[in-house]
């Protein structure tokens, strides 16, 4: 009933709660002397379903048979309509349409940890749309049965709050869940289990790692577990890896030795536990322990390269370069590099420790045979030294690789190709491809890059430290014993027309011709490798096409003579630069008048 119903009643048969698809009879009847004033036969009773009229009748009562009600709650209201007045609410009723509960399925119970409590879950099946009460029942030793009710609208979980203990781990317990509503009841199939079946241990805690004598080969993992744990599984991986190494151990008693860890590597460790070989379930994984393994002495050898530069008749500058060891070779933090320089005949040796750099420059006499050895040191020791005899890398012309070319290969890559040297190609032991940014001053501070290539290769893709719109000086060395030959070429990965032309800084007269000098275009405006300069000139105030002279680009050149100007004529001159992609805009304009005599 939804209000006081002073004027009449609404009755519902067979019940306010019905099965989906059932028919209900709704009767609305007026109480005595509650009809329309004066004219009782003018009483008009109207039945509403929610706000929609579904039936009416003149008189003291109204009967309506209703079918096809949807799942859920439907509200019926009976009203009285009299002539010349508003409808008056008489009474109403709610009808609840639903279904009997389905049999609960997949009942399973678990106790989290030896100190935890038993909780069970199940699948309810389809919604009944009615108030449904679930009763969970757990029977076991001592003829005891614990029960608990759940009155939540969607109940599929209950915690008994009871702790099962291992006094008799083989004792059987049986769980069952029963669903009951106004239309029926249904019970799950029973689920029978023992203590060992349902106790899921807590994950291990207090995980620690110890390295005996600071050695990665003597490593023990320690942890704490609940008392009854029999089995553990360990998983570990380097922090930067996605793949786990797995180990299963029995009766570990909270410790296990790990034998295959890599040095100087951060690892993540996790452990899980189980009470029985084939009963029960694994615990969740423990919280991760992250730990770095100790260093070991480096393995592998440094990749070393060098450059020689002539200083004067008696001295030369040697610049050594080397690449960092890979993490797996360094096996620790490299503290310094040890460089030993030795004159082979006289036996003089000089050793220096280098920190913070991967290069070293020194000046040595041009006479004598010199060798260097470079090794890397961490806290545990040094790598094997890389030994190199210092030689003139380009001295053997017959060893020079032929037909060297450099072509752009996608973004920030250059493909370098060559042909073997004319001299017996089988003499070549290896090729070295070297590249560095082209700087007009031939600056020795510019970083040097190199890669080594096997003697049967005739190409190399260079991609390390390659930037777009930068010109690189590329050399290919062929090495054979204590001899070397080289060829060089300029190359870029991407180019476009230079952003500016050269700046003419001076024009001077020399014996009837002129010498033009210019400043190089700034490297960042060259936009690749320059191929040519062009010098343009025309008579001032003339509309004729300018004349031009094209000069092949050479790194060190910054002046050029022109001898086709007429004396006592004022000329305007300017310059441009060209890459393979096109010509720059004009540089500055200069006027010049040759003073010499006419022919």
């Amino acid at each position: 009933k939804i209000d006081a119903c002073k004027r009449g009643d609404v009755t519902v048969k067979p019940s306010h709660v019905i099965l989906l698809g059932s028919t209900v009879n709704i009767t609305c009847s007026l109480k005595p002397r509650q009809g329309c004033f004066h004219y009782s036969r003018r009483n008009k009773l109207i039945l509403y379903k929610f706000d929609r009229r579904i039936n009416f009748h003149h008189g003291h009562s109204l009967n309506s048979q209703v079918t096809g009600l949807p799942l859920g709650t439907t509200l019926f209201v009976c009203k009285l309509a009299c002539i010349n007045s508003d409808e008056i609410q008489i009474c109403g009723a709610e009808i609840f349409v639903g279904v009997a509960p389905e049999q609960p399925q997949n009942l399973s119970c678990i106790q989290k940890g030896e100190q935890g409590t038993v909780a069970c879950t199940w699948e309810r099946g389809r919604d009944t749309h009615l108030y449904t009460e679930y009763t969970l029942q757990l029977s076991g030793p001592k003829n005891l049965t614990w029960q608990k009710q759940c009155k939540d609208i969607y109940c599929d979980y209950l915690d008994f709050g009871i702790n099962l203990t291992p006094e008799s781990p083989e004792s059987n317990f049986t769980a069952k869940v029963t669903a009951v509503n106004s239309l029926g009841s249904s019970s799950s199939l029973p689920s029978t289990f023992t203590f060992l079946d349902i106790v899921r241990p807590l994950p291990p805690w207090d995980i620690r790692i110890k390295f005996q004598k600071a050695s990665v080969s003597r490593c023990t993992l320690y942890w704490r577990d609940e008392g009854l744990v029999l089995l553990n599984r360990l998983r570990y991986r380097p922090s930067n890896s996605r793949l786990w190494n797995m180990v299963n151990v029995t009766k570990a008693k909270g410790r296990h030795d790990l034998l295959d860890l890599k040095p100087f590597t951060e690892y993540e460790f996790q452990i899980s536990s189980k009470l029985h070989l084939y009963k029960g379930s694994w615990s969740d994984w423990s919280e991760s322990l992250r730990a770095q393994t100790p260093e070991e002495e480096p393995t592998g050898m440094l990749d070393v390269w060098y450059m020689k530069r002539h200083i004067d008749y008696s001295r030369q500058q040697i610049s050594l370069f080397w690449k960092n060891l890979s993490v797996s070779e360094a096996r620790g933090k490299i503290l310094h590099y040890q460089v030993t320089l030795q004159e082979l005949t006289g036996g003089k040796a000089m050793t220096q420790n280098i920190t913070g750099h991967t290069s070293w420059t020194t000046v040595i006499p041009r006479t004598g045979n010199w060798a260097v050895a470079v090794s890397a040191a961490n806290s545990k020791g040094s790598s094997l030294p890389t030994r190199i005899n210092i030689m003139n890398l380009c001295e053997a012309g017959l060893l020079a690789p032929r037909q060297v070319s450099a072509n752009s290969e996608g973004m920030d890559n250059i493909l370098v190709t060559w042909q073997p040297p004319r001299k017996d190609p089988s003499a070549v032991q290896e090729y070295v491809v070297e590249w560095r940014e082209l700087h007009p001053g031939g600056d020795t501070q510019v970083p040097l890059n190199w890669l080594r290539s096997r003697p049967y290769n005739v190409s190399a893709l260079i991609s390390e430290n390659i930037k777009s719109y930068i010109c690189y000086e590329i050399r290919v060395y062929a090495l054979s014993g204590d001899q070397g030959g080289c060829s060089s070429i300029l190359g870029n990965s991407k180019h476009k027309a230079p952003l500016s032309g050269p700046h003419i800084n001076a024009i001077t007269e020399e014996k009837g011709s002129i010498l033009i000098s210019w400043n190089s275009i700034p490297v960042q405006e060259q936009m690749g490798c320059l191929l040519h300069y062009r010098i343009y000139w025309k008579e001032r105030d003339s509309n004729s096409q300018p004349q031009l002279c094209e000069i092949p680009y050479r790194v060190s050149q910054n002046s050029h003579p022109i001898n086709s100007l007429q004396p006592r004529v004022t000329y305007v001159l300017w310059m441009t630069a060209l890459t393979a992609a096109g010509e720059s805009s004009h540089g500055n304009e200069r006027e010049f008048c040759l003073q010499g005599k006419a022919n």
């Epitope: 409590t117 001592k142 009710q149 099962l164």
Partner: nanobody, 125 residues
Framework: QLQLVESGGGLVQAGGSLRLSCAAS????????VGWFRQAPGKEREFVAA???????TYSEFVKGRFTISRDNAKNTVYLQMSSLKPEDTAVYYC???????????????????WGQGTQVTVSS
């Protein structure tokens, strides 16, 4: 210290009903398991029913379907509603509280830490 006081006992005819109350003072016992035991003259103390902190309950076989245990944590009270009483239900009824987590063996007197003084229930034929 938790004190337990039972009330509601008395004389009742066979087939009648009684409602026993167990009121706690000194501590809030919403986290406790509370059990009812009874002892008839010349007999051992026996388990009747128990209810734990999560309102799970259990009954001994001989009262199942006739007795109902419930708790009102706001009032710090546990109730035992007894109906269809029989002369063999005559005994002193004790309530007891278990401080630790509920173990399966809540039907054993040794599991309980606190006991009341008891209330007499007599069922006449």
């Amino acid at each position: 210290q938790l004190q337990l006081v039972e009330s509601g006992g008395g004389l009742v005819q066979a087939g009648g009903s009684l409602r026993l109350s167990c009121a706690a003072s000194g501590l809030t016992f919403s986290g406790y398991t509370v059990g009812w035991f009874r002892q008839a003259p010349g007999k051992e103390r026996e388990f009747v029913a128990a209810i734990n902190w999560s309102s799970a309950y259990t009954y001994s076989e001989f009262v199942k379907g006739r007795f109902t245990i419930s708790r009102d944590n706001a009032k710090n009270t546990v109730y035992l509603q007894m109906s269809s009483l029989k002369p063999e239900d005559t005994a002193v009824y004790y309530c007891a509280a278990q401080r630790s987590r509920t173990s399966w063996y809540a039907s054993t007197a040794e599991a309980y830490d606190y006991w009341g003084q008891g209330t007499q229930v007599t069922v006449s034929s």
